[in-house]
């Protein structure tokens, strides 16, 4: 057993060396080890074949080190590995696409808070058993086509707290088992109409705290199992372009956050879901070029990149151009009591799923690596109401395993000592 480690055999053969100030993977790790805990050290490099002798290894924790480089063959020979935690290694920045090849039994991979700027082609190739992929709080700007194509058993994909600006057509191809997709706190301005085509089992989609002004309902159509949708804290344009989304939300049977309008000014702060169809008229004048839902070639429908309803001959275009009424009462940043809940002024009683602020929370001890607000915008503080609570897996046995999700903020949790401790 390496000097800084503790080794024991029951109930699993374990080599445990956490927070020992180790600067390298120790030599002499017992070959029979089924679990290796190396978290919280000062390891900066994982050389090739570091664990090759440990053929029975199922759990490897290398989180909270100072990893800057992982050799492509670092995990060679670990055919039985099920859980690999590399999170909290902010200097890592990139991972060789061959690093995880051969890990055919891997079911959980933690790569959150690793400073990742891109996902190289084929990075997740062959990880057919993977169920949980943690990529949150990195610096990812794009989702390359077919990145997750081989992950047919993936159920949870955490991509929040990155710098992703669009969701292209093939970003999520192959994710036929995906239950939960977290894309909040990014810079997403565009979602391709076919981006979610393979996500027929998706139950939870978080898109709050992005840069969406519109969302093609064609993208939502394949989401037959969707139960929880969060769209708050986006600059929604509630004019004729929002009619399809409005109609989809009226029919949606699941739980959804508020969808607060940014434009036109007369509807600012109002919830799209609670507007009447005839509120959604004309074309709001934006303070800059209109960004279409998807930047593709011009069509007969949208010859100028503008929806048909916004073209000069559109019958209802004038209503938004008239002098607007004052912005609606109700602060877009305050939670609202849904109809049927307790009357104003009476905050007691049960809290319901739509009655509170939701999003990035103040006071996190370890904020995300990246400030994920669009450039020039203020941080959300207390974003618009989303669901009060996050109902998670539909399983009712209360066993969370990897299943449960907390609320919006990111980071390592808490702010140290409590009052009175």
């Amino acid at each position: 057993c390496p000097g800084a480690c503790v080794c024991y055999n029951e109930p699993k053969v374990t080599t445990s060396c956490p927070q020992q100030g180790l600067q390298a993977v120790p030599v002499g790790i017992p070959a029979a080890s089924q679990r290796i805990f190396l978290h919280g050290n000062r390891i900066s490099h994982v050389p090739a074949a570091s664990f090759r002798a440990c053929r029975n290894l199922t759990i490897l924790w290398l989180h909270s080190n100072v990893l800057a480089r992982i050799d492509a063959a670092a995990f060679t020979g670990l055919a039985l590995l099920e859980q690999l935690d590399l999170s909290d290694n902010a200097q890592l920045r990139s991972v060789d696409p061959a690093t995880f090849h051969g890990l055919g039994r891997l079911h959980t991979l933690h790569l959150d808070r690793c400073g990742l700027q891109e996902l190289g082609p084929g990075l997740f190739r062959g990880l057919a058993a993977l169920q949980y992929l943690y990529l949150q709080d990195n610096a990812l700007q794009a989702l390359p086509d077919d990145t997750f194509r081989d992950l047919g058993n993936l159920t949870h994909l955490f991509l929040h707290g990155n710098r992703i600006s669009s969701v292209p057509e093939r970003a999520f191809r192959g994710l036929h088992s995906l239950d939960r997709l977290l894309l909040h706190q990014n810079r997403v301005a565009h979602v391709h109409p076919h981006a979610f085509r393979d996500l027929g089992r998706l139950m939870t989609l978080y898109l709050f705290a992005n840069n969406l002004s519109a969302l093609p309902t064609e993208a939502l159509a394949p989401l037959r199992a969707l139960q929880y949708l969060r769209l708050n804290d986006n600059p929604w344009v509630c004019d004729c372009r929002a009619r399809p989304l409005w109609a989809w939300l009226q029919k949606f049977r699941g739980s959804s956050s508020e969808v607060p309008c940014s434009l036109p000014q007369r509807l600012a702060g109002r919830d799209l879901k609670r507007l009447a169809a005839n509120d959604l008229q004309g074309c709001a004048v934006a303070t800059g070029p209109y960004h279409p839902i998807w930047t593709g070639r011009a069509t007969d429908e949208e010859p100028l990149g503008l929806p048909k309803c916004c073209q000069p001959d559109a019958a209802d275009k004038a209503s938004v151009l008239e002098p607007g009424r004052p912005a609606s009462a109700g602060n877009a940043l305050k939670g609202r009591v849904p109809p049927g809940d307790s009357p104003p002024g009476n905050g007691s009683g049960p809290r319901h799923i739509n009655d509170s602020p939701f999003g990035t929370l103040p006071g996190s001890a370890e904020p995300p690596l990246t400030a994920v607000r669009p450039e020039g915008s203020e941080p959300p503080g207390f974003p618009t109401s989303g669901p009060r609570r996050r109902p998670g897996c539909s399983r009712k046995n209360r066993t969370r395993s990897h299943c449960r999700l907390g609320q919006a903020g990111s980071g390592g949790g808490g702010t140290g000592d409590s009052e009175g401790s």
């Epitope: 609570r389 066993t399 390592g412």
Partner: antibody, heavy 125, light 107 residues
């Protein structure tokens, strides 16, 4: 700075009820998942109940089911724990605590990271 | 309910020693375990969550590891202020359950 400020100590007769408050500052109550834990003199920690953010409901330990009620007043950011039909073995310090998991997204972070100072409830005839 | 069993129930060690406390769950809880420190007359303080994640502000001499059913809290280079009772808690499902506690005394 996050704080949970609890109401003061009370002495109660057997059969009576007690309602302990836990005022949140630094956050709004609707952002948090609050749980209650008690500790009898010289004994260990015992979870009583709290908000389950997975199922959007308040859950209780079986032992206290029917005797304990957890409520919130979001207008004052105060959580309450009411325990009825008190008996001498309910003499304990009652703590409210914040569930850290509610603040995080990956949710390998479930734990009680902030606690109130505790409220001593003595049940004696 | 998941039973949590800590051992030893009490331990006495000297400043500078290394102390290990173990916690065993009656069923697999993956890595969903927290450790708390409690000093007399005070509220518990979170040390470690998710079996191995060190809570902000907690000294590096505290470390946690384990998964499945067996977990350990290790205190390297024991300090006088570490005299306290330590509790594990499973956070995998409801009801949340605590171990019975381990009392650590400094010789």
């Amino acid at each position: 700075q996050m704080q949970l400020v609890q109401s003061g100590a009370e002495v109660k007769k057997p059969g009576a009820s007690v309602k302990v408050s836990c005022k949140v500052s630094g956050y709004t109550l609707s952002e948090l998942s609050i749980h209650w834990v008690r500790q009898a003199p010289g004994k260990g920690l015992e979870w009583m109940g709290g908000f389950d953010s997975e199922d959007d409901e308040t859950v209780y330990a079986q032992k206290f089911q029917g005797r304990v009620t957890l409520t919130d007043d979001t207008s004052t950011d105060t959580a309450y724990m009411e325990l009825s039909s008190l008996r001498s073995e309910d003499t304990a310090v009652y703590y409210c605590a914040r569930d850290l998991g509610y603040l995080t997204s990956g949710n390998y972070y479930d734990a009680f990271d902030f606690w109130g100072r505790g409220t001593m409830i003595t049940v004696s005839s | 309910d998941i039973q949590m069993t800590q051992s030893p129930s009490s331990v006495s060690a000297s400043v500078g020693d290394r102390v290990t406390i173990t916690c065993r769950a009656s069923q697999d809880i993956n890595r969903w375990l927290a450790w708390y420190q409690q000093k007399p007359g005070k509220a518990p303080k979170l040390l470690i969550y998710a079996a191995s994640r060190l809570q902000s502000g907690v000294p590096l001499r505290f470390s946690g590891s384990g998964s499945g059913t067996d977990f350990t809290l290790t205190i390297n280079s024991l300090q006088p202020e570490d005299s306290a009772t330590y509790y594990c808690q499973q956070t995998n499902n409801f009801p949340r359950t605590f171990g019975q506690g381990t009392r650590l005394e400094i010789k």
